[in-house]
């Protein structure tokens, strides 16, 4: 086979996504090694081929994208998975090539399962909120392309176990969950959980942050503030966007 | 697409206890509830309880409690309702309902229960 | 428990009609409501979740409304198959509980 540039297994990228959800992945060549988007290179007459190894096996094989229901395909330089099911785990490889270029990064997937109260081995994303600052608020993560905006989806969030209602001071609107006055007592695990239709079935985003109420120091001054309403994403939780 | 199968209909006497099966297709089970409803003849519906399969968590009404049990083997992912110490006003229509969240989203055919001596 | 009262218990229209089925709930259930459609010997099917979210695949005539205690199931335009009964039920809070049903029959 011709020489191809490799980028080997991205593990900054270690993609965790739930068991029996959409998960929409993009090619990181695109956003990490290359100087140009998909667009330009497709103009260019390069071509985008997925493959992938199965957990536990060192055979590269093509990804079927013709299953039942298109479970699995791919759109532009988008990999999409209509569910996820626990076996899609493996590391994945996209190849950008023609007959004279070649460029190649691997990432891994982890499909994972949740219990009943959204406990996983994922890897959460933490978001501070300043105590007894004004109203905080934090934002349904990594949902974006998932529906088009036509579609309203229903969104239901959770701190741990239990549906967010009636609380004093946390209020769920929408994608949003507001903290009318962030305390210490609102420290813990916050779920929303997206609903929407697509072409006849339901599909269902799962999405966990962790919320660490901090002590506010004012000579940080309002920038600092400003900050603690951005989401600190870990690199790996990037691959949505 | 999304299948619930449930056993066949049952009679059974005063005071037994009866087993209905629900297997699930279509769906991955163990990340999913899996509600129990009845309903008596020309009655409404009425939730007995739920369980999550993949950890086992279970949450009954208050009326059954002790007197049914869910359980789910996920190898077959088949989940089942056992109701104890039958009497007359238990014959009815049970159904299997799978939620992702707390609504039941698909269910099973049902199953009729009928007690009688 | 939380109780769900529907109303009407039954009712006839003609095809075309507008109808609209209403449930009320004994306490603030925060929009955390279900409709279900039960045709005659038939299994119950999901038609809206939390509220007014549509299930896929049903019919865009199917609209709900409503908050706190009191909630609303409108058919725009009801139709030959739409012949069943209705069911609100209620998740805020366990154990789930479903109001006593709307029978719904054509003129």
């Known amino acids: 086979s011709e020489r191809c540039d490799d980028w080997g297994l991205d593990t900054m990228r270690q993609i965790q996504v739930f068991e029996d959800e959409p998960a929409r992945i993009k090619c990181p060549l695109f956003e990490h090694f290359l100087k140009f988007n998909y667009s330009t290179a497709h103009s260019a007459g390069l071509t985008l081929i997925w493959y992938w190894t199965r957990q536990d096996r060192d055979l590269e094989e093509p990804i079927n994208f013709r299953l039942p229901e298109n479970r699995i395909s791919k759109e532009k330089d988008v990999l999409w998975f209509r569910p996820t099911l626990l076996n899609d785990t493996g590391n994945y490889t996209c190849m950008l090539r023609n007959t004279t270029y070649c460029s190649k990064v691997a990432f891994p997937l982890e499909v994972v399962q949740k219990d009943s109260c959204f406990n996983s081995p994922m890897k959460l994303p933490v978001h501070k909120l300043y105590i007894e600052y004004g109203i905080q608020r934090i934002t349904c993560p990594n949902v974006d392309g998932y529906f088009p905006s036509s579609v309203k989806p229903t969104i239901t969030w959770y701190m741990g176990c239990y549906k967010i209602q009636n609380f004093n001071n946390v209020i769920p609107e929408g994608m949003n969950l507001s903290f009318l006055i962030a305390l210490i007592s609102n420290n813990g695990n916050y779920t929303c959980v997206v609903t929407y239709p697509e072409n006849g079935r339901t599909f269902h985003l799962t999405r966990t942050l962790t919320v660490k109420v901090v002590g506010s120091d004012i000579s940080r001054g309002l920038n600092d503030i400003f900050e603690a309403q951005k989401i600190e994403w870990h690199e790996h939780h990037h691959h949505h966007h | 697409q999304v299948q619930l199968v449930q056993s066949g209909a049952e009679v059974k006497k005063p005071g037994s206890s009866v087993k209905v099966s629900c297997k699930a297709s279509g769906y991955a089970f163990s990340s999913s509830w899996m509600n129990w409803v009845r309903q008596a003849p020309g009655q409404g519906l009425e939730w007995m309880g739920r369980?999550?399969?993949?950890?086992?968590?279970?949450h009954y009404a208050q009326k059954f409690q002790g007197r049914v049990t869910l359980t789910a083997d996920k190898s077959t992912s088949t989940a089942y309702m056992e109701l104890s110490s039958l009497r007359s006003e238990d014959t009815a229509v049970y159904y299997c309902?799978?939620?992702?969240?707390?609504?039941?989203?698909?269910w099973g055919q049902g199953t009729l229960v009928t007690v009688s001596s | 428990d939380i109780q769900m009262t529907q109303s009407p218990s039954s009712l006839s229209a003609s095809v075309g009609d507008r109808v609209t089925i209403t449930c009320s709930a004994s306490?603030?259930?925060?929009?955390?409501l279900n409709w279900y459609q039960q045709k005659p010997g038939k299994a119950p099917k999901l038609l809206i979740h939390?509220?007014?979210g549509l299930h896929a695949g049903v019919p865009s005539r199917f609209s709900g409304s409503g908050s706190g205690t009191d909630y609303t199931l409108t058919i725009s335009s009801l139709q030959p198959e739409d012949v069943a009964t209705y069911y609100c039920?209620?998740?805020?809070?366990?154990?789930?509980?479903f109001g006593g049903g709307t029978k719904v029959e054509i003129k």
């Open positions: 939390y509220t007014s």
């Open positions: 309902g799978e939620g992702y969240l707390d609504p039941m989203d698909y």
């Open positions: 039920q209620q998740y805020s809070i366990l154990p789930w509980t």
């Open positions: 306490q603030g259930i925060n929009n955390y």
């Open positions: 369980i999550y399969p993949g950890d086992g968590n279970t």
